[in-house]
């Protein structure tokens, strides 16, 4: 029998400074590019080593990201959003929801739309 | 993290083919389709080389020139795992293969490539001899 799995759901807001090579770090997701099911929302797929994000240390791999300097980054093209990150200045304030998981009993299946896993 | 580890290697004669397969285990809160995936080799005295990569949609693929047209890398997301088929050996292709991952998506500093270059994660490699 499967135990159940949980997730706890926090959001942070995380400032950043660019550095010499940028932000740090990888997306996807966006209206034209929907991994998660039901989803259009932009997630964190990379955290570059001895980036921005990495050296600050609160952004992750899996963190969806609200809003940038206060924009929604809600129903977003791709690129657009992309775009959005890539002018957004030296000093970036990232509005994130991080969503860990948590276990309760045996290991749980995780379907094919869940981010986590 | 992701730990990689690598299969499908072996003795096999020139002409011959072998199929290597890499299964990756993802820490919780990620998942194995957000990686971009490649294939290095590394054979005796020389440099670890590039050989094949797919990306994390895998909707791009990129070779070397080396094994174009012998081989195809592919992936099976709900399997965690890559592939690399590989045709009409040759002595040349004697190496330990690699498996090696990366976050995939669009970098949101500046336009990259799948192909060769900064790979966060790798597996411990497959040795594969092709004899005459």
């Known amino acids: 029998m499967n135990g159940r799995v949980d997730y706890l759901v926090t959001e942070e807001e995380i400032n950043l400074t660019r550095g010499p090579s940028g932000l740090g770090f990888n997306i996807v997701g966006g209206t034209d590019q929907q991994y998660v099911s039901n989803d259009s929302g932009i997630y964190v797929s990379r955290i570059k080593e001895n980036g921005a994000a990495a050296l600050d240390g609160r952004l992750q791999e899996g963190d969806k990201i609200l809003s940038v300097n206060g924009q929604d980054l809600k129903n977003l093209l791709h690129q657009d959003a992309v775009d959005l990150f890539r002018n957004a200045g030296y000093a970036v304030s990232l509005r994130v929801q991080h969503r860990l998981q948590v276990q309760n009993g045996p290991i749980g299946h995780r379907g094919e739309g869940d981010p986590s896993g | 993290d992701v730990q990689l580890v690598e299969s499908g290697g072996g003795l096999v004669q020139a002409g011959g083919s072998l199929r290597l397969s890499c299964v990756a285990s993802v820490a919780s809160g990620r998942t194995f389709g957000w990686y971009d995936m490649g294939w290095f080799r590394q054979a005796p005295g020389k440099e670890r080389e590039f050989v094949a990569a797919?990306?994390?949609?895998?909707?791009?693929?990129y070779y070397a020139d080396s094994v174009k047209g012998r081989s195809t890398i592919s992936r099976d997301n709900a399997k965690n795992t890559v592939y690399l088929q590989m045709n009409s050996l040759k002595p040349e292709d004697t190496a330990v293969y690699y498996c090696a991952a990366r976050g995939g998506g669009t970098s949101v500093d500046s336009d990259y490539d799948v192909g060769e270059f900064e790979y966060d994660y790798w597996g411990q490699g497959t040795q594969v001899t092709v004899s005459e």
């Open positions: 797919i990306s994390w949609s895998g909707g791009s693929t």
